[in-house]
Amino acid sequence: MELKAEEEEVGGVQPVSIQAFASSSTLHGLAHIFSYERLSLKRALWALCFLGSLAVLLCVCTERVQYYFHYHHVTKLDEVAASQLTFPAVTLCNLNEFRFSQVSKNDLYHAGELLALLNNRYEIPDTQMADEKQLEILQDKANFRSFKPKPFNMREFYDRAGHDIRDMLLSCHFRGEVCSAEDFKVVFTRYGKCYTFNSGRDGRPRLKTMKGGTGNGLEIMLDIQQDEYLPVWGETDETSFEAGIKVQIHSQDEPPFIDQLGFGVAPGFQTFVACQEQRLIYLPPPWGTCKAVTMDSDLDFFDSYSITACRIDCETRYLVENCNCRMVHMPGDAPYCTPEQYKECADPALDFLVEKDQEYCVCEMPCNLTRYGKELSMVKIPSKASAKYLAKKFNKSEQYIGENILVLDIFFEVLNYETIEQKKAYEIAGLLGDIGGQMGLFIGASILTVLELFDYAYEVIKHKLCRRGKCQKEAKRSSADKGVALSLDDVKRHNPCESLRGHPAGMTYAANILPHHPARGTFEDFTC
C-alpha cells in the first residue's frame, strides 16, 4: 500500500523528541546537549559552550548589522589612461561689460546711472576724474536737451555693446590648426556677452585631443581693448576696477558660471593652464549626499542637472520672485530687468542671495560629475625683444601691446583622467558573508540549519495545537480520504529505540516513505 507524504495528511502525528532532533541536527553541539544520557557535567559544559558561542555570535552580528546601517563609504582614487579625451568647453569674458564706443545717447539716457556714468539727475557726476577725450564724447552724448528717448532693452544693449570676439581674437590655434571667431559661441553671463569655445551646442561635435602638452590644446591671443573700457566714476555692480578676462573651463554638460567659478587672466602675460580631467562618482543617500539624476532634471530651465545649472535656475527663480524680472544671462520667459530694476532690485537681490542667504540656493551634488583640475603658470608678454615686432604686426603702440595683449594656453597635462569614486564600504553581500562566517565559526550553522530549527519548532507547535483538538477532524478526514495505512500505534509497536541506541547510523529506509521524514530516512528521526 502506498504511503502519502504530504504535510496536511496527518495532523496529529507526534513530533520527534528533542533528543532525536538534536542528534540529527546540523547545528553543532546540539547533539551533545540533548543526548540520551542523563544530566552530566559533560552535557552542562557543552550547554555552556554553546550558549557562550551563541552570545558572542549575537554580539558580533549585532555589531556587523549596526556597522552596515551606518552606511559608510570609502573613496577610491584611480588614474585611467585614455587614447583620446574630449576637450572641455572654455568660456571667456572680458571684465568690461560694455564698450565705450558702442554706448549711444539712448543707452546713456536709460543706463547711464546703472553704469555710474551719470547721476540721478542725468548729469556727469565728477569731471575731475575723467579722461579729456572720453569726457568730451560723454558730454556730447549726455546732452539730452530736446532728446526723445527710444525704447531700450538690456539684452539688446549687452549684445550690441559687449566686446566682440572678432575684435578681441588676434590668433587662435587648436591642436596646431587655425581656429577663428566662428568657433566661439556667444553666451550671456553676469559679465555680459561672453564666448564659449567647444561648447558642443552649436551643432558641431565636441573636439577631442589625442596627446597631452601645449601643442595639443587651445592657444589664443586676445586684445582686451582697454581703450573701450568704461570710465569708473562710481561703484555699481556693473563697474569693474580690473582689466583682463575671466575664464572658466567646464564640461559641455553644464552652463558656465563664470562670475563665481572663473579664474582671471591678465594682459601682459602668457598664461599656461595645464588641465586634468576628473570624473567624480558620488553615492546617493544613505551612503552619500548626491542627487541621483533622472531623465527629468527637476530644474525649471535646464534639461540636465549640474550644480551650476541648479544655481542659475535657483537664482532666476529668486530674482523673478523678488523683482518680477530676470537678468540678461538668466533663462526663462520673464521680462528682462530694466536698468532701474537692475540697480534697485536685481543686483542687490542677487548679491544678497550669493553672499548672505545660506539656505535658498543649496544645490545637491550630482552623482556623476566631470571637473577639470588646473595648474596655472605665466610668463611675461611681450618680451623687450618682441615688443616692437608685435606692435608692428598688430599696428598698435608698444604700450598698447603691453597693456592689452594676453596669450592663453589650455591643454591636458597627460592623456589620462582621474576617477574619484565613492564606494559602499560594506554592502549586503559583505554583511551576509560576515554573519554566515560568524555563524559557521561560533555555532556551525547555516541558513538551512536555521530552517531546520524553524521546521522543528513548527512541528512542536502544531502538535501542541492538535492535542487541544483543533486538528482531530482534519486528521480523520485525511486518513479516510488518503488511505494512510500506518497508524502511530503501529509505529510505536516496533519500539526500535533500544536497538538503535547502540547503532550510530540508525536504520535507513527510503526517503519519503513516512510523513515528516527527512531525506536520510533514519527510523530514529521520527520515532524516538
Epitope: 542687490p348 542667504d357 539656505e359 535658498y360
Partner: antibody
Amino acid sequence: EVQLLASGGGLVQPGGSLRLSCAASGFTFSSFAMSWVRQAPGKGLEWVSGISGSGVSTYYADSVKGRFTISRDNSKNTLYLQMNSLRAEDTAAYYCAKEAYKWQPWGQGIRVTVSS
Amino acid sequence: DIQMTQSPSTLSASVGDRVTITCRASQSISSWLAWYQQKPGKAPKLLIYKASNLESGVPSRFSGSGSGTEFTLTISSLQPDDFATYYCQQYNSYSYTFGQGTKLEIK
C-alpha cells in the same frame, strides 16, 4: 501686494507668557528669512530674533535668549514669537519684517506691555 | 556682535539745509547697511538699502554712501517732512544691529 499683519499683543504680568503672530501675504513666504524687531517706549530699535526660510535655523539677541522662541508655519504663511518669562524691559512695540536684500515690508507693530 | 555707532545723536537744522548723518560699524559689513526714518507712533520707513540704493517712492534728496565700516546718509535739501529720527541697521550678519538713532529737529 506684499503685506505683514502682526497680532497677539497685550498686557501681561512679569513672568507671564505671550505669543505674537505675523501673517504674511503677497510673496512666497517659505523663500524668505523673517525677523522680529522691537522698540521700547522712547528708545531705539532692537533686533530680537530671526528665522531662516525653512525654519531650520533660528537666531536670538542675547537679551531674549532662552526666553523667546521664534517659529514659523510655512503652510499658513505665519511667523510666531513665543515669549516666556516676560520682564518689564520686554515692554515694547514689536514689528515683524521680511529679510532680504532690503527689509521690506515691516508689520504695523503690536504693543506688548509687561506690568504687574 | 557688530556695534553700530551713529552720530550725531541729535541734529538741529533748518529747511533747505544739507544734512549728513554718519554710521560706523565695529567691523566690516560690506555694503549691507540700511537707513530708516521713523516718526512717533509709526513703523520705521526704509529709505536706503545696501548702503546706497534708494527705496522706490523715497525722494531723491536722500542718498546713501559708504562701504566696509563707514557709511553716511545725506539729505541734500531738508524739507519740513524730513524732521524725524533716523536709524542705520547692519544686516551683514546675525545678530543684526541698529544704530542708537539720530534725532533730526528744526533749528
